[in-house]
Structure formats: structure tokens, C-alpha cells
């Protein structure tokens, strides 16, 4: 899988879309997980409704929401109030039994809020044609976790 880069601005919302073959993945729940390391575990952030027919209902875990258009074949994840620590490598997954197929690998890049200069250095906003070797950039205009919370506890 190639990696798709989604860029968002700190404090704003970022919407990530993962297209898939609706027939091939018919009847399967979906999930969004964070890759904790290059070869480490992908820790579940949020998954779609337990009843596949209700996958269109938005489910939240903290500041992250997931909803699935099972007919159109598009999984949508919303990261609300984006924070620098939300950056990272994620996966959209299709679940079957205890297995998970990767629908898309997503790199979330968090750009500093241009109006907030507390932590940011010089800002540069990439143009639409910015290219990556094996990553496609998607621009998205766009509850921070408490320090003591586990970043992404598994969800059912």
C-alpha cells in the first residue's frame, strides 16, 4: 500500500477518506488504527457500529469520529481539534473475524496554526502540486487527549 498524506491545521478539523470496493468488503465493519511504530502494533482508535447496517452512524472515541458509506464504498474519519500529537501513520481497516485488511495507509501531518506562534517556527503551506515519492497528498482545510490518558485505547 502506498501512503496517502492528509494535512491539517492544529486546532481545526481534518477529514480523512478511505475509498474501498463496496462489494468486496460487503458486510464488514471498518476501523481506524494508529501505527505505534514502523513494525509495531496498529492500535485501534475507533471502529464503526457493531451492527454493519448501522455503519452510517457516526461513532466517536475522544476527538476522533468514524462513519462508513457502505454503498458508495467510502470510510470517513474526522479528527476534531487537531493537535500536533495527532500526527502519525494510521490505517483504515476492513475487519473480518479477528483479521483486518488494510484499505489505506494514511500519514496525518499537522501544520501549526499560523495564528498561534507559541510553538511554531516559520510556516510553509504546500501547494496543490507538492509531490512525494510514494505518498499522495490530500489537503484538508480543516478534545485534545489529557496528558495522562493512553493515546489510543482499543475500542470494541
Amino acid at each position: 500500500h502506498n501512503t496517502t498524506v492528509f494535512q491539517g491545521v492544529a486546532g481545526q478539523s481534518l477529514q480523512v477518506s478511505c475509498p474501498y470496493d463496496s462489494m468486496k468488503h460487503w458486510g464488514r465493519r471498518k476501523a481506524w488504527c494508529r501505527q505505534l511504530g514502523e513494525k509495531g502494533p496498529c492500535q485501534r482508535v475507533v471502529s464503526t457500529h457493531n451492527l454493519w447496517l448501522l455503519s452510517f452512524l457516526r461513532r466517536w472515541n475522544g476527538s476522533t469520529a468514524i462513519t462508513d458509506d457502505t454503498l458508495g464504498g467510502t470510510l470517513t474519519i474526522t479528527l476534531r481539534n487537531l493537535q500536533p500529537h495527532d500526527a502519525g501513520l494510521y490505517q483504515c481497516q476492513s475487519l473480518h473475524g479477528s483479521e483486518a485488511d488494510t484499505l489505506r495507509k494514511v500519514l496525518v501531518e499537522v501544520l501549526a496554526d499560523p495564528l498561534d506562534h507559541r510553538d511554531a517556527g516559520d510556516l510553509w503551506f504546500p501547494g496543490e502540486s507538492e509531490s512525494f515519492e510514494d505518498a499522495h497528498v490530500e489537503h484538508s482545510i480543516s478534545r485534545s487527549l489529557l496528558e495522562g490518558e493512553i493515546p489510543f485505547p482499543p475500542t470494541s
Epitope: H85, L107, E109, A120, L123, F132, A135
Partner: antibody, heavy 119, light 107 residues
């Protein structure tokens, strides 16, 4: 194999400037956050600055904010650290590191380059 | 900023010993902790991330545990190549801060 090779260190007078470079290979450079971590002689590790994968945003430790500028050239797989208004306390080995995005841990390190600030 | 304090600062042990190094955060950091090993004149190497995940190629004798404010790096059976300085690091929320290090020496 991931490789990070720093260059540009040396002796500089207080108030002077220096530019460090880090040539990266063995991975898709443009997909990774990068950072510099330094270590003063006989001391522990100190995070200096981090940069997002596109170069869109930079983050600095308070100790270097306003004096150091981090940048990258993804077409050349190279990371840069421009250091201005150098002080004696900036004397350290500077390590170029690959940061696991959003997590702030450093999975690969260069061999380091020594910066000495002295008159 | 959150401070990371390691103990002991130095430790003497023998090959085959079980060794424990602790790291204490001044505030709750959840499971957001990494451990590194550094040998003299060399760059640090990542050992453990997110408290308990071993990095690629790290031997199974290294393990990490803890949560909140108290963390432990354990070497189950010390090998000659393990004599080094070990650092903990608070991760996930910047600024990324390191402990002062624990030097593990041969007894």
C-alpha cells in the same frame, strides 16, 4: 538500511553561526518527521527541534527558539539546522534523528557532529 | 514542563544479573514513554517505545513496564554488550524530555 549522516559541525565563536546538514537514505524521507537531539559533553540528551514531513511546521525547544532554524529539502533527502547567535551552552554533539510522527520518539539516529562554541 | 527522573544514576552489576532501572515522571504521562541505550562515543539506540513495545532487533531480554508516573526497564539476564547508559524519554506530547540517564557498569 536507514542511514543518517550529519556534517557541518566545528569550532565557532560565541555569537557566531553554523549550519548543520543531515543526508538521509534508506527510507522515504518525505514521509517522516525529522528532528535534532543534542548532547553536551558528559551530559544527557536534549531535544532541540522537530520538523513535519513536508517542512510545513517546525517546533523548537525553548532553549533554542528564535536562534535556530530547522528546514529540509525533500528533493535532496536532506535536513538542515541553521544555528545563529551561538552560545557556549550550545556546545554539544548534535544528532540527526528520524522522529516517529506525532509520537516524539526517535527510531534512527545519525552518528552525530560536534559543535564547539568557544572564544 | 514534565521532568523525568531516573534511578539509580549509576549501577554496578555482573553478567547474568537481572537489572531494573526506574524512571519517574513529575506528572502522569500515561504509557507515553521510550527507552534508549547509549554506549560511549556512539549515538543512542531506541530500545522500547510506548512503555513496552520492543523496537526492531532489540533482544527479548529487554522489557519495559509501568504507567502513569512510574516506569521500569528490565534486563532479564545481563550480557557483556548491555553495559551502557540508559535514558528514558517522555513522548507523545512535546516538549520531548529525557531522564538524566543511568550508567550501567560492570561489577
Amino acid at each position: 538500511e536507514v542511514q543518517l549522516l550529519e556534517s557541518g559541525g566545528g569550532l565557532v565563536q560565541p555569537g557566531g553561526s553554523l549550519r548543520l546538514s543531515c543526508a538521509a537514505s534508506g527510507f522515504t524521507f518525505s514521509n517522516y518527521y525529522m528532528a535534532w537531539v543534542r548532547q553536551a559533553p558528559g551530559k544527557g540528551l536534549e531535544w532541540v527541534a522537530s520538523l513535519t514531513n513536508s517542512g510545513g511546521s517546525t517546533y523548537y525547544a525553548d532553549s533554542v527558539k528564535g536562534r535556530f532554524t530547522l528546514s529540509r529539502d525533500n528533493s535532496k533527502n536532506t535536513l538542515y539546522l541553521q544555528m545563529n547567535s551561538l552560545r557556549a551552552e550550545d556546545t554539544a554533539v548534535y544528532y540527526c534523528t528520524r522522529e516517529w510522527a506525532g509520537s516524539g520518539y526517535f527510531d534512527y539516529w545519525g552518528q552525530g557532529t560536534l559543535v564547539t562554541v568557544s572564544s | 514542563d514534565i521532568q523525568m527522573t531516573q534511578s539509580p544514576s549509576s549501577l554496578s552489576a555482573s553478567v547474568g544479573d537481572r537489572v531494573t532501572i526506574t524512571c519517574k515522571a513529575s506528572q502522569n504521562v500515561g504509557n507515553n514513554l521510550a527507552w534508549y541505550q547509549q554506549k560511549p562515543g556512539k549515538a543512542p539506540k531506541l530500545l522500547i517505545y510506548y512503555t513496552s513495545n520492543r523496537f526492531t532487533g532489540v533482544p527479548s531480554r529487554f522489557s519495559g513496564s509501568g504507567s502513569g508516573t512510574d516506569f521500569t526497564l528490565t534486563i532479564s539476564s545481563l550480557q557483556p554488550e548491555d553495559f551502557a547508559t540508559y535514558y528514558c524519554q517522555r513522548i507523545y506530547n512535546s516538549p520531548w524530555t529525557f531522564g538524566q540517564g543511568t550508567k550501567l557498569e560492570i561489577k
